[in-house]
């Protein structure tokens, strides 16, 4: 009997099916949707939480000005094909044959096609903004303060690496936090700056995807910080290639 | 960039043996924990085998316990599942897998494509 009998869940992904049926006793768990199995001890890459979602029953100034080559995520929920790492596979489809090709967080880059669409390689986001609106509050957040706890949370809850997280500015009522994370940067072991942003927007949400964990209790100096609207930018390492009609519509 | 390529499957008779070889690339082997995993068609990926790093420790499910045995060559970087007494039910495409294991979790961070292994008389 075996601390994995006792305790066999995956505290970072509520969205897996665990058992102790691993080598020796040990815990096991594989995402719902895809079957693959995942490291508990990081978060679970975003395709593969994509995935389970999919396969879950249906109930339920001194501020950035984003690049004109900035991508929003529009699209909203697909089920997306994964590689063997849990990685987006650089061409996605739908049931009805329509492709279209993605970044490293899933996101759209290009018009949608037929089967015949091309895409050579899954592009990099090395920049992502992440735009929020705070409810108001008494009075405008210490911008100080307000810095060290996003990077905290982005330490601590995330795992991500302070040196990914690249500026936090604030102008009430907006926040906004830059995540820059090169490809020559990554090392093994690293989170990705993709999953850390999709874990924060769940979190923010109301959605968190901890196991067991409470949602996210953000506060500043004591103070709550509840947000009423977020935004999240994705740049690419190669600008995405839309026609022109997408670009003046 | 972490490369792993099974070998040696086929079509095998109920009762029959075959032996698995997997060729490690882009990252420490010797350090590595390994693994095979199956996956049946229709069915979920199960683990078969683990090794640790330096051979001196492995697991079977009850499943393959007493048939399956697996080992490694280190100076080679190459993974090996000797398979014996096979049976319909072993037929799977089997792929071999960096593993690693923590006090009370077991994880598999990369696969092979695999190699289809069919037991049929």
């Known amino acids: 009997h075996t601390a994995a009998q006792d305790n066999c869940t995956c505290p970072t992904n509520k969205m897996t099916v665990c058992s102790p049926d691993g080598p020796g006793g040990r815990c096991q768990c594989r995402a719902l949707g895809s079957g693959m199995a995942v490291d508990c001890s990081t978060l679970t890459s975003k395709c593969l939480l994509l995935k389970a979602r999919m396969s879950a029953p249906k109930n339920a100034r001194t501020l950035v000005r984003p690049s004109e080559h900035a991508l929003v995520d529009n699209d909203g929920l697909y089920d997306p094909d994964c590689d063997p790492e849990g990685r987006f596979k650089a061409r996605q489809c739908n049931q009805t044959s329509v492709c279209w090709c993605v970044n490293s967080v899933g996101v759209r880059r290009t018009d949608k096609g037929d089967l015949s669409l091309r895409c050579d390689e899954l592009v990099r986001t090395h920049h992502i903004l992440i735009d929020l609106r705070h409810r108001p509050t008494a009075g405008a957040f210490n911008h100080s303060d307000l810095d060290a706890e996003l990077r905290r949370l982005f330490r601590e809850r995330y795992r991500l690496h302070p040196k990914f997280v690249a500026a936090v500015h604030y102008e009430q009522p907006t926040i906004q936090i830059e995540l820059r994370q090169n490809t020559s940067q990554k090392a093994a072991g690293d989170v990705d700056i993709g999953d850390a942003a999709y874990y924060f927007e769940r979190d923010i949400k109301g959605e968190s995807l901890f196991q067991g964990r409470g949602g996210l209790d953000l506060r500043v100096r004591g103070e709550p910080l509840q947000v009423e609207r977020t935004l999240i930018y994705y740049l690419d390492e190669i600008p995405p290639k839309f026609s022109m009609k997408r670009l003046t519509a | 960039q972490v490369q792993l390529v099974e070998s040696g499957g086929g079509l095998v008779q109920p009762g029959g043996s075959l032996r698995l070889s997997c060729a490690a690339s882009?990252?420490?082997?010797?350090?590595?924990?390994m693994s095979w995993v199956r996956q049946a068609p229709g069915k979920g990926p199960e683990w078969v085998s683990y090794i640790n790093a330096d051979g001196s420790k492995t697991y079977y499910p009850d499943t393959v316990k007493g048939r399956f045995t697996i080992s490694r060559d280190n100076a080679k970087n190459t993974l090996y599942l000797q398979m014996n007494s096979l049976r319909a039910e072993d037929t799977a495409v089997y792929r071999c897998?960096?593993?690693?294991?923590?006090?009370?979790?077991?994880?598999?961070?990369?696969w092979g494509q695999g190699t289809q292994v069919t037991v049929s008389s």
């Open positions: 897998a960096r593993a690693k294991l923590t006090d009370t979790h077991y994880v598999e961070d990369y």
């Open positions: 882009g990252f420490p082997f010797s350090s590595a924990d």
